[in-house]
């Protein structure tokens, strides 16, 4: 029997203080440029070393990003979001969505990492 | 190791138009952020234009923005930089710079630390 994939997704807010050279990090996605099919979504591509984000170890590449100070990242253009990260101050709250993913057992089994149980 | 060499600089009137080239050799170019960087006297070098081909993006600087387009010719290795309706506030000596492109945009306003390339520069002059 195969084993079965499937993904805990957790949310949280991440304060970052800009450092010197930015946020540190680069994003794909919007709805002219989307990164994962049927979802306009803002993810995370890369993280800078030594960067801000980098430095707080809590931003992952592959998070999604849902808001920027609030504000929602849904069914906005690529250079849209490129733009609202780069006028949002020096401190810098984003809303994420990390999507893990937990290796479970033959399907019909319950393991450990199953998060339905 | 990839080298960089700009030509196309000159002396020209306010209101006229220049085209910058950059020449790279010794990398793999499509794989490279090409970028335009300027530096006026007692000025700090500055950002003027990039262009990210694996990202299909391109960014100016706002001081630039619908006078100056960035262009590159992947079969050739080169960057260029079209410069219309020249001021003199452009006057300055203009580098390319280069960098690995990687996924997606930077949310960060462009920082020559990242840039790994730099050419030695052209000068430009707008009386």
């Known amino acids: 029997m195969n084993g079965r994939v499937d993904y805990l997704v957790t949310e949280e807010e991440i304060n970052l203080t800009r450092g010197p050279s930015g946020l540190g990090f680069n994003i794909v996605g919007g709805t002219d440029q989307q990164y994962v099919s049927n979802d306009s979504g803002i993810y995370v591509s890369r993280i800078k070393e030594n960067g801000a984000a980098a430095l707080d170890g809590r931003l992952q590449e592959g998070d999604k990003i849902l808001s920027v100070n609030g504000q929602d990242l849904k069914n906005l253009l690529h250079q849209d979001a490129v733009d609202l990260f780069r006028n949002a101050g020096y401190a810098v709250s984003l809303r994420v969505q990390h999507r893990l993913q937990v290796q479970n057992g033959p399907i019909g089994h319950r393991g450990e990492g199953d998060p339905s149980g | 190791e990839v080298q960089l060499v700009e030509s196309g600089g000159g002396l020209v009137q306010a209101g006229a138009s220049l085209r910058l080239s950059c020449a790279a050799s010794?990398?793999?170019?499509?794989?490279?952020?090409m970028a335009w960087f300027r530096q006026a006297p007692g000025k700090e070098r500055e950002f003027v234009a990039e262009d990210s081909w694996s990202n299909h993006r391109v960014w100016y600087s706002d001081s630039v923005k619908g006078r100056f387009t960035i262009s590159r010719d992947n079969a050739k290795n080169t960057v260029y930089l079209q410069m219309n309706n020249l001021k003199p506030e452009d006057t300055a000596v203009y580098y390319c710079?280069?960098?690995?492109?990687?996924?997606?945009?930077?949310?960060?306003?462009?920082?020559?630390?990242?840039?790994?390339?730099w050419g030695q520069g052209t000068q430009v002059t707008v009386s």
């Open positions: 010794g990398g793999t170019f499509s794989s490279y952020a």
């Open positions: 710079a280069a960098h690995r492109d990687y996924s997606g945009s930077t949310v960060d306003p462009p920082n020559q630390s990242e840039y790994d390339y």
